[in-house]
């Protein structure tokens, strides 16, 4: 199967139209949420089958999985299918809606489950909370699936911030039916260690007096046995703990560690596993990409976020134009680095009510004794345009000139327009655009200057009107990525008395 574009993840604009194509040696079909959306199927002269799925007027609700599969009545011996995940960032959609059965999660054992709260924008930071608590839980999040981990019998909600509003998901309820009289949990002091460091795992059983522990681990397979230590946690009834301690770990100690617990009275047993990774040396790795040019709007707050993985915990520094940044006492800059899982970190630089002077070259550096990584970007401060001056003059040449001056960042575009019928303009008659025709009626001259200190562009445009035979409303509109501004002036013919 060949899918175009290949994905596996696409981020598409809201309200746009997008075409997905899948082709194969047998009939193919696109599937979305276990259904086949309307699509165009065809067979080429060379015997290739294809299906084209056109997604129109995209909204956040189009976020999700799309599959292309063989749709062959001959029953081809294949379960090949291609998965594509599409994000349509849509600020009007908070969390994607769930079916009722996704809100209630039923279990008979302690096992990893997923709380499927998903957002439309892969850049959003999503946190998980107990419904009754405010503290974010340290559970890994996958934007395509949700939060995966081992959850207690509680109710949970997800939170994110879209723009400046906090959005909560529906509540998810975890129901666990205790069918086994043995309840085993395994945890490690660390699941990632460097060679030479220690591995320590604990296996705890609740509610049983007489149990037998058996550990399986990579060293055991090579005949190198480690003697576990078993103890009773006296402050809790029937909490029995087995500790497996491996000093000075080697790379070969990476793998699955399983604790199997048996209870002979009722012949119950349970086992839990955990993965341990031994790395040669520490690491720091960036996750995702941050564009080399970032934008912030003047007087608005802006948070710049970098996500990375590291072990051991790194030191994180932020620099602007090679000078170290720190939390400012005036509250203009806030720096934070959060540990969102054992080895994953989110570092944020928040600029509060951005000022022009905060434009520049920013670098985040994360490092420890084994490795370092740095990420740099240029921050451009966008300034909404404003028209500073619109004036009209009558030079001796007989023509009349109108001069418009304005500023903004990025560089403003200038649009001149005029209205000849003052009574009906602009409500009934649309204004006529000026200066972009080859007619001799008007001529346009525009100069652009970049002011280094203010970090913005100034546009000065002069419109020359050859003959004005009746009063004319002339409008100068400046536009850039973050706004527009307009001013108007009435130009009267030479022959009329001064207005």
């Amino acid at each position: 199967l060949v899918v175009t574009p290949p994905g596996p993840e696409l981020v598409l604009n809201v309200s746009s139209t997008f075409v997905l194509t899948c082709s194969g040696s047998a009939p193919v079909v696109w599937e979305r949420m276990s259904q086949e959306p309307p699509q165009e199927m065809a067979k080429a002269q060379d015997g290739t089958f294809s299906s084209v799925l056109t997604l129109t007027n995209l909204t956040g609700l189009d976020t999700g999985e799309y599959f292309c599969t063989h749709n062959d009545s001959r029953g081809l011996e294949t379960d090949e299918r291609k998965r594509l995940y599409i994000f349509v960032p849509d600020p009007t959609v908070g969390f994607l809606p769930n079916d009722a059965e996704e809100l209630f999660i039923f279990l008979t054992e302690i096992t990893e489950i997923t709380i499927p709260c998903r957002v439309t924008d892969p850049q959003l930071v999503v946190t998980l909370h107990e419904k009754k608590g405010d503290v974010a839980l340290p559970v890994p999040y996958d934007h395509q699936r949700g939060f995966s981990g081992i959850f207690e019998d509680r109710s949970y909600i997800c939170k994110t911030t879209i723009g400046d509003r906090e959005v909560d998901s529906d509540a998810y309820y975890v129901y666990r039916l205790q069918v086994s009289s043995i309840n085993v949990s395994v945890n490690a002091v660390q699941t990632v260690v460097r060679q030479g460091e220690n591995i320590t795992l604990m296996c705890i059983v609740i509610g049983n007096e007489v149990v037998n522990f058996e550990w399986t681990y990579p060293r055991k397979e090579s005949g190198r046995l480690v003697e576990p230590v078993t103890d009773f946690l006296l402050d809790m009834p029937y909490h029995i703990r087995s500790i497996l301690h491996i000093p000075s770990a080697e790379l070969e100690d990476s793998g699955t560690y399983t604790c199997n617990v048996t209870e002979s009275v009722n012949d119950h047993q349970d086992e839990k596993a955990i993965n341990i990774t031994v790395v040669e040396s520490g690491y720091v790795r960036l996750l995702g990409e941050v564009g080399t040019l970032q934008f912030a709007e003047l007087h608005r707050s802006r948070t710049l976020q970098v996500v990375f993985e590291a072990y051991p915990p790194p030191t994180v520094l932020w620099f602007k134009d090679n000078r170290t940044l720190g939390d400012s006492s005036a509250g203009e800059i806030a720096l934070s680095t959060r540990n969102v899982s054992e080895t994953r970190y989110v570092s944020e630089l928040t600029l509060v009510r951005v000022k022009v002077a905060e434009a520049g070259h920013y670098t985040m550096r994360a490092f420890h004794e084994d490795a370092e990584v740095q990420l740099s970007f240029q921050l451009q401060i966008n300034v909404p345009v404003r028209v500073l001056e619109l004036s009209e003059s009558h030079p001796d040449s007989g023509e009349q000139t109108v001069r418009c001056r304005g500023r903004g960042m990025p560089q403003p575009n200038i649009i001149w327009s005029a209205c000849r019928d003052l009574k009906r303009c602009p409500r009934e008659l649309p204004p006529t655009l000026l200066g972009n025709s080859s007619e001799e009626e008007s001529q346009l001259e525009t100069n652009v200057t970049y002011w280094e200190e203010e970090q913005e562009f100034e546009v000065v445009s002069t419109l020359r009107l050859q003959h004005v035979d009746r009063p004319l409303s002339v409008r100068c509109t400046l536009r850039n990525a973050v706004g527009q501004d307009t001013q108007e002036v009435i130009v009267v013919p030479h022959s009329l008395p001064f207005k």
Epitope: K131, D153, R154, S155, L177
Partner: nanobody, 116 residues
Framework: QVQLVQSGAEVKKPGASVKVSCRAS????????MQWVRQVPGQRLEWVGL????????VYAPKFQGRVTMTTDTATSTFYMELFSLRSDDTAVYYC?????????WGQGTLVTVSS
């Protein structure tokens, strides 16, 4: 303390219906649903549907839509789940369960056997 007590085991013929009851005591979760879940031997728990305490709101899993009805007798705080047109693969233990926010509560289960 919340307690959910379910009716006893049932043996039914294919095509018949079964009505399982779940009596709740200490149940004060006026905004909490009563869930119905089943476990076919050797398989995972499967959600059947839910009803609210006043019995005026129900949601059924698509798989059981049209074949299940959930009702409530508010006077006796008893919840009912009735499954129609039984098939042999409906043989399972049926549980009622509710959630208090910080933990869940389960009935002891009702074994329904469908056999000709």
């Amino acid at each position: 303390q919340v307690q959910l007590v379910q009716s006893g085991a049932e043996v039914k013929k294919p095509g018949a219906s079964v009505k399982v009851s779940c009596r709740a005591s200490g149940y004060t979760f006026t905004n909490s649903f009563m869930q119905w879940v089943r476990q076919v031997p050797g398989q995972r728990l499967e959600w059947v549907g839910l009803s609210n305490p006043s019995g005026d709101y129900t949601v059924y899993a698509p798989k059981f839509q049209g074949r299940v009805t959930m009702t409530t007798d508010t006077a006796t705080s008893t919840f009912y789940m009735e499954l129609f047109s039984l098939r042999s693969d409906d043989t399972a233990v049926y549980y009622c369960a509710t959630h208090g926010g910080d933990r869940s509560y389960w009935g002891q289960g009702t074994l329904v056997t469908v056999s000709s």
